[in-house]
Interface confidence: low
């Protein structure tokens, strides 16, 4: 008769490091000791006629256990295969590129350490909850990769790696482990350089707006802009509108920046840079400054008029050019009455990179001269009718401007000058018209002949 040795449970599945209660039993009517043959840590819990119970502890790997017993002079055996399952110790998605260009492939790489049985372990790469790749875990550590074409929609998207240990056929369910997500940052940086709008010339200590624009940028808000005049960084205001970035700054030239300079605009995104440069000439245009040796001259004195400007500036004073750029233009004159109030004009011309820039300045000369009464404006003999209105049209000149008074000889009677007045016979007589100032007096005799009013 053939007897059996049963091992229970048959082909169990348990979690790594766990314990297992094993029962060996036989229908052989033998009192022989039943032995459990295994390399695992074992402990006999109880035994009886034809049976023995053992406890296996710290089961870390797959194992085949064997029970054996002597029965009627022979040995019978029974076996069971233990399958150990364990969740991965590490599920890690490799770091993503700091920035990924849209339209280019990047690799998702997931490393899985541990996890058994490997035949039941699957690695899934995810974007949000969308499966990108599903592959079995093979080596130790298992490495699973997927190539992904980066799109705008991926900007800010979380990528993760999930392991699925499928123990459902064994009635244990599906065990899921997920890595920490990693966020992708995608970008678009056009190959074209930014558009840089800047002045060709910039005068020292003056300001001018500078604009730098780049279209087709994504995400525009993440881009960094560097605007500079030479080595002087400009304080830029950056605006984003959709995929367009505009940086505006005010360039102010310093005296030490005179000469050929560059305005630079750098737009950096995703570790890449686009640059635009424009040439600019910083110039200094001093003057023109017109000077009088005596702003207020005495009649007959010599006055020097000079006009100067900065280096490389050509000046022309009242049509007379200076000998060379950067030199002073000068003229001399004997001050006369006719020069009083005369304006001297100076024009300055500076050539900057083939362009001519012009500036003008003027100065007015004052000449001090004694009082005069112009005979042409002051008739010496007046014939007026009694009881009529007239104006004594006399004009004096001089610098300082003289006071003009007409007094009747032999009396203190004064007639107004330049103002209409009512004439009567008492006005008849000779008048001394005197212009006086701090520079002297000038007298002109005016005779008034008043014709009496005839009643018929």
């Amino acid at each position: 008769q053939e007897f059996l040795l049963r091992v229970e449970p048959q082909n169990p599945v348990l979690s790594a490091g766990g314990s297992l209660f094993v029962n060996c039993s036989t229908d052989c009517p033998s009192s022989e000791k039943i032995a459990l043959e295994t390399s695992l840590s074992k402990e006999l819990v109880a035994s009886g006629m034809g049976w023995a119970a053992f406890n296996l502890s710290n089961v870390t790997g797959n194992s085949r256990i064997l029970c054996s017993v002597y029965c009627n002079g022979s040995q019978i055996t029974g076996s069971s295969n233990i399958t150990v399952y364990g969740l991965p110790e590490r599920v890690e998605l490799a770091p993503l590129p700091p920035w990924q260009p849209v339209g280019q492939n990047f690799t998702l790489r997931c490393q899985v350490e541990g996890g058994s049985p490997r035949t039941s372990l699957t690695v899934v790469l995810l974007r949000w909850e969308e499966e990108l790749s599903r592959q079995p875990a093979v080596e130790e550590p298992a490495e699973v990769t997927a190539t992904v074409l980066a799109s705008r929609d991926d900007h800010g998207a979380p990528f993760s790696c999930r392991t699925e240990l499928d123990m459902q056929p064994q009635g244990l369910g599906l065990f899921v482990n997920t890595s920490a997500p990693r966020q992708l940052r995608t970008f678009v940086l056009p190959v074209t350089p930014p558009r840089l709008v800047a002045p060709r010339f910039l005068e020292v200590e003056t300001s001018w707006p500078v604009d730098c624009t780049l279209d087709g940028l994504f995400p525009a808000s993440e881009a960094q802009v560097y605007l500079a005049l030479g080595d002087q960084m400009l304080n830029a205001t950056v605006m984003n509108h959709g995929d367009t970035l505009t940086a505006t700054a005010t360039a102010t030239a310093r005296a030490d920046q005179e000469g050929a300079r560059e305005i630079v605009c750098n737009v950096t995104l995703g570790g890449e840079r686009r640059e635009a440069r424009e040439n600019l000439t910083v110039f200094s245009f001093l003057g023109p400054i017109v000077n009088l040796s005596e702003p207020t001259a005495h009649e007959g004195s010599t006055v020097t008029v000079s006009c100067m400007a900065g280096a490389r500036v050509q000046v022309t004073l009242d049509g007379v050019p200076a000998a060379a750029p950067g030199q002073t233009a000068q003229l001399q004159l004997n001050a006369t009455e006719s020069d009083d109030g005369r304006s001297f004009f100076c024009s300055a011309t500076l050539e900057v990179d083939g362009e001519f820039l012009h500036r003008n300045s003027s100065v007015q000369l004052r000449v001090l001269y004694g009082p005069k009464i112009d005979r042409a404006t002051c008739p010496q003999h007046l014939k007026w009718k009694d009881k009529t209105r007239h104006v004594l049209q006399c004009q004096a000149r001089g610098n300082p401007y003289p006071e003009l008074r007409c007094l009747k000889e032999g009396s203190s009677r004064e007639v107004p000058v330049g103002i209409p007045f009512f004439v009567n016979v008492t006005h008849n007589g000779t008048y001394q018209c005197q212009a006086s100032s701090s520079r002297g007096k000038y007298t002109l005799v005016v005779v008034m002949d008043i014709e009496a009013f005839s009643s018929h």
Epitope: E89, R90, E92, A94, P95, L96, P97, P98, R109, Q111, E113, E143
Partner: antibody, heavy 119, light 106 residues
């Protein structure tokens, strides 16, 4: 087997720069981050920074931020550490070390490169 | 940055003695790594994730701790254990090491 082999000892003058190399073998170079650690004579370990050779991403100890540059050449599986504006206090043994993951730490170290800064 | 303070800085022990050294963090860390270094040699990984022994490390070594307080213990000191031990964290940049505990043979 994993190996990290560093370049030989260097003697430099103050103000100069030094570039130390670390050639890796026995594993996939792009998978593991490479760290640089230095040790002044008779002193402890001081972390300088690391590189992820897969992305060329680097992070540095703020103390060396403006003077250290860590690079990697994946075609030769070699990492480099360049330290500029050297001063006498930079005299130290410089190590490269692989980060094997949280379950391992800095699991493999180079043999070290002695850099001496002296006028 | 997280500062790791090791104590004592220097200690000596006789063979067979139990040895404990500590590593205190200025703020809480998840786990600590320990490295052993002997003169004119590169550091060797010794204990990872606070309490796991690296490959080839004798079982007389153990690591424990949590939060901001960690320790390395040698149950029975042996001559070959004389070395400097460094603790290390990487919860945040910069990665930092302790100043080391030098263990001498008495």
């Amino acid at each position: 087997q994993v190996q990290l082999v560093q370049s030989g000892a260097e003697v430099k003058k103050p103000g100069a720069s030094v570039k130390v190399s670390c050639k890796a073998s026995g594993y996939t170079f792009t998978v593991y981050w490479m760290h640089w650690v230095r040790q002044a004579p008779g002193q402890g370990l001081e972390w300088m920074g690391y590189i992820n050779p897969n992305t060329d991403y680097t992070e540095y100890n703020q103390r060396f931020q403006d003077r250290v540059t860590i690079t990697a050449d994946t075609s030769t599986s070699t990492a480099y550490m360049e330290l500029s504006s050297l001063r006498s206090e930079d005299t130290a043994v410089y190590y490269c070390a692989r980060w094997g993951g949280n379950s391992y730490g800095l699991d493999y170290w180079g043999q070290g490169t002695l850099v001496t800064v002296s006028s | 940055q997280i500062v790791l303070t090791q104590s004592p800085a220097l200690m000596s022990a006789s063979p067979g003695e139990k040895v404990t050294m500590t590593c205190s963090a200025s703020s809480s860390v998840s786990y600590i790594y320990w490295y052993q270094q002997k003169p004119r040699s590169s550091p060797k990984p010794w204990i990872y994730l606070t309490s796991n022994l690296a490959s080839g490390v004798p079982a007389r070594f153990s690591g424990s701790g949590s939060g901001a307080s960690y320790s390395l213990t040698i149950s029975i000191m042996e001559a070959e254990d004389a070395a400097t031990y460094y603790c290390q964290q990487w919860k945040s940049i910069p990665l930092t090491f302790g100043a080391g505990t030098k263990l001498e043979l008495k």
